[in-house]
């Protein structure tokens, strides 16, 4: 029978005869930076090229005895998970191994950097098809490691890494914290985050998605036909590297941004038991388990968006947090969130020729997060229209006035420390979809975008009684680009997108003594691209 | 300790001046920063990645490495250039005493220096 992990990554709606995308990853080269490997293992024989690259520290301890099977165990198992004949994800993918971890599974940042440079040099000397680099290792946060990963990613290489096995925030580790790297956490057969002894999978905003990482059957270096079950975020990363190889084999022109968006899109949503994560990390951690796309699915028509959380701003009065999209993505909306509710909103700013989302802390606040909605939209051109605080009772309004521009997101920012002391505005009058409305003391920012065939609509969901959470979702075929609260009063903690759903969070009203008049509405902006739909119909 | 023979033109210049100020003066405001792993047991002091500014010409990596070796030698410190990076980041990997960090941070073209640290199979 098929191992649980391979079953889990197989799409629910697959048909047995067309499960595997064309060539099963054969157009893709996967580089594995790990321990030495047993290349003559039946699972990977003929599929792996052991490069002459080796940069490892000496083993610790005077009594250490090098035993080939021990030295090769980690790398051999991962090679099997990526492309093993029987238990591999991408059975057609070719693998190249670089030794950067010693027999104790230990390496150095510098040794790994030299390995990454070796890959880049090889790519320059002999350009091949799509490259996936698997980094099943972790160290402490490293500026230089992350920078090197960024450079390699910008050279068109897809990097996949383990989130780390420290039951900790993945942002404290490298290369897991590198934004350009696809960072993978581990889940088990019960869709629980993996526990590893007293520790377990890392979590948090630096994780892109999760994948099977417990009791994973794969090649064992004990003998050339042996198999062993192993657990860890390395195994999870190996699954995603395999899925990436399959996707790139089916669509070799995919950019890193497109691949990441597809991985997120085809993942199983909201299946992980979030109670395992620390409470403050639950909202930041993606509830996504990687899966292969259905093979007939050419996803080009889709408007893909993902949510990117910033680092926490910290508690100082003027602290800000900035969320950024990847190089090829467009920032379509910007929101903010604060656990204390003390924030001064958010706005889209230009930084180094790119739009970023900046959130502002308020006096007495514990800090804020900026939340960017990052989308893939060809030939998009966006601008921000701002209305200063109206001061009048009707609230502040702004709309997209340029011809062909549609509203993709609304942000509001205020200088007053507590909006709650000011009368909230009425909700936006119906029938004005291209308009943002906010508190009279706030400046309102409309993200207005033009792209071929782009159409958007505003969806509102208001609850008359106070609620801790109000949600509104976009219908099938529409993608959530913007998520904001109405009204902008102080008991609103903020708004953020989870997959295709807009979530507006409020303080527990029973503890704040707020009146039932302080109702909250969630405003979702849902978009689609008729241009992309037509293009995909022509393909079919 | 073994390593490639360095080109000591820089050291010749450095020794022309017996007053420290002149020989070791940085050619720019010392804005370079030093980074090390927050997890103490994972630190590997004695090996450093010197990263040069992004726009630095590739020949500068070798030149800056030689300059560091020369100025270090002048102070009686041994250094070993373990690797010069060209294809990802401009810079080099050097084995040296932590005493030399201040000197290295003042070198022209240096963006930041990071102490080496351990990584682990996951």
């Amino acid at each position: 029978s098929i191992p649980w992990n391979l079953e889990r990554i197989t799409p629910a709606r697959y048909r047995a005869d067309e499960y595997q995308p064309p060539k099963g990853g054969s157009l893709v080269e996967v580089y594995l930076l790990d321990t030495s490997i047993q290349s003559d293992h039946r699972e990977i024989e003929g599929r792996v090229m052991v490069t002459d690259f080796e940069s490892v520290p000496e083993e610790d301890g005077t009594r250490f005895h090098r035993q080939a099977s021990k030295c090769d165990s980690h790398g051999t198992h991962l090679a099997g998970v990526v492309s093993g004949r029987d238990a591999g994800v991408a059975k057609g993918a070719g693998l190249r191994s670089l030794r950067v971890l010693n027999c104790q599974g230990k390496g150095t940042v510098s040794g790994t950097l030299i390995g990454l440079e070796f890959i880049r040099k090889s790519q320059l000397v002999q350009p091949v098809g799509p490259l996936v680099v698997l980094l099943p290792l972790a160290g402490g946060y490293s500026r230089v490691f992350n920078a090197a990963c960024q450079r390699l990613a910008r050279a068109g290489v897809v990097l996949v890494t383990a989130a780390g096995n420290f039951r900790d925030d993945a942002c404290l580790y490298s290369p897991a914290s590198a934004p350009e790297v696809i960072t993978v956490g581990a889940t088990n057969a019960q869709d629980q985050p993996v526990t590893l002894g007293t520790l377990g999978t890392n979590f948090g905003r630096c994780v892109d998605l999760f994948a099977p990482g417990e009791d994973i059957i794969g090649a064992s270096s004990d003998c050339s036909t042996c198999f062993v079950s192993r657990s860890g975020t390395s195994q999870a990363a190996a699954h995603v590297a395999g899925i990436a190889a399959m996707m790139l084999s089916a669509e070799p022109e995919l950019t890193l941004a497109e691949l990441r968006q597809r991985l997120i899109h085809f993942s199983a949503k909201d299946v992980i038991n979030e109670a395992w994560f620390p409470e403050d990390q639950r909202v930041l951690t993606p509830n996504l388990v990687a899966a292969l796309p259905p093979s007939t699915h050419r996803a080009g028509w889709q408007l893909f968006c993902r949510t990117v959380w910033s680092a926490h701003s910290g508690p100082t009065r003027m602290a800000t947090a900035v969320a950024r999209c990847a190089q090829d993505e467009e920032l379509l909306s910007c929101s903010s969130f604060s656990r204390s509710g003390k924030r001064r909103g958010e706005r889209i700013e230009a930084q180094g020729g790119k739009r970023v989302c900046r959130a502002h802390n308020a006096f007495g606040g514990e800090g804020v997060y900026a939340i960017a909605r990052c989308c893939l939209l060809p030939q998009v051109n966006c601008s921000v229209h701002t209305a200063p605080p109206a001061g009048a009772s009707m609230g502040t309004r702004v709309h997209c006035h340029q011809q062909g521009h549609v509203l993709t997101g609304c942000s509001s920012h205020w200088e007053v420390e507590d909006l709650g002391t000011h009368k909230p505005p009425v909700l936006r009058p119906r029938g004005q979809p291209n308009q943002c409305v906010g508190h009279r003391e706030a400046s309102i920012h409309a993200s207005c975008c033009h792209a071929p065939g782009l159409e958007c609509k505003v969806k509102e969901h208001g609850i008359p009684a106070p609620q801790e959470q109000v949600i509104v979702a976009c219908e099938d075929g529409w993608t959530l680009t913007g998520c904001s609260p109405l009204p902008g009063t102080s008991h609103v903690l903020g708004a953020y997108a989870v997959d295709n759903t807009c979530v507006v969070r409020s303080r527990d009203v029973s503890t704040t003594g707020s009146t039932s008049k302080e109702a909250v509405a969630a405003v979702a902006i849902c978009c689609r691209s008729r241009h992309l739909v037509q293009a995909s119909q022509e393909l079919q | 300790q073994e390593d490639e023979d360095g080109d000591y033109e820089e050291l010749v210049l450095a020794l022309r001046s017996e007053e420290d100020g002149l020989a070791d003066a940085p050619e720019h405001g010392a804005t370079a920063t030093f980074h090390r792993c927050a997890k103490d047991p994972w630190r590997l002091p004695g090996t450093y990645v010197v990263v040069l500014k992004e726009e630095t010409h590739r020949s500068q990596s070798e030149r800056t490495a030689r300059r560091l070796q020369a100025q270090a030698a002048r102070r009686g410190y041994l250094t070993k250039i373990l690797h010069v990076f060209h294809h990802l980041l401009p810079g080099f990997l050097v084995k040296m005493s932590g005493d030399l960090l201040e000197l290295a941070l003042k070198l022209p073209h240096v963006d930041y220096i990071e102490e080496d640290s351990s990584v682990f199979a996951q």
Epitope: - | D3, Y8, E18, D20, A73, R75, G76, Y77, G98, D99
Partner: antibody, heavy 114, light 108 residues
């Protein structure tokens, strides 16, 4: 200009102790490795010990290990050599030298004799 | 330990002649850290050559150094009266730092 001046030499009995000093001026003392080198009468040069600029690293020749201690006081721009359990074969002129041995002091004579 | 052997022990030459002093190491030496010194009676040694071939500040051009690996040479192209002294080679690339036993250049 760079100057190194040794002091503290003299006549001492075998088994006795002596502390040599080397006062430095004309350069940023704390930036430099400093060395002690000795020369027995009519013989060649023998390296004794050195210390890094911060004082965190020290090395010794096997012949003095465990008996001599090198140290420095960067606030006083002074290098020291504490010599214990002195033997007749330690009789020599002791020089301090800077960094890459580009500057040397004039030397101080240590005589170990009963 | 790296042992440095200098030859000849004594070199008897006249002013104006060329002097060639040899220094052989028991194992390969990083030439960045090979130096030559001159010492006159009652004086401290003076650095002549560092990095195997670079002249120190104020050293006349008649002094030159060459070599790599295990074999190094100090050449004085034309001896001046003030050049008659003892010359030492030294390696400081490895601990313990070692000196050669010296070559005495005397007037013939």
């Amino acid at each position: 200009q760079v100057q190194l001046v040794e002091s503290g030499g003299g006549l001492v009995q075998p088994g006795g102790s002596l502390r040599l000093s080397c006062a430095a001026s004309g350069f940023t003392f704390s930036d430099y490795y400093m060395h002690w080198v000795r020369q027995a009468p009519g013989k060649g040069l023998e390296w004794v010990s050195n210390i890094s600029g911060s004082g965190s690293t020290t090395y010794y020749a096997d012949s003095v290990k465990g008996r001599f201690t090198i140290s420095r006081d960067n606030s006083k721009n002074t290098l020291y050599l504490q010599m214990n359990s002195l033997r007749a074969e330690d009789t020599a002129v002791y020089y301090c030298a800077r960094g890459m041995f580009d500057f040397w002091g004039q030397g101080t004579l240590v005589t170990v004799s009963s | 330990d790296i042992v440095l052997t200098q030859s000849p022990a004594t070199l008897s030459l006249s002013p104006g002649e060329r002097a060639t002093l040899s220094c052989r190491a028991s194992q390969s030496v990083n030439s960045n850290y090979l130096a030559w010194y001159q010492q006159k009676p009652g004086q401290a040694p003076r650095l002549l050559i560092y990095g195997a071939s670079s002249r120190a500040t104020g050293v006349p051009a008649r002094f030159s150094g060459s070599g790599s690996g295990t074999d190094f040479t100090l050449t004085i192209s034309s001896l001046e009266p003030e050049d008659f002294a003892v010359y030492y080679c030294q390696q400081w690339g490895d601990v313990p730092i070692t000196f050669g036993q010296g070559t005495k250049v005397e007037i013939k």
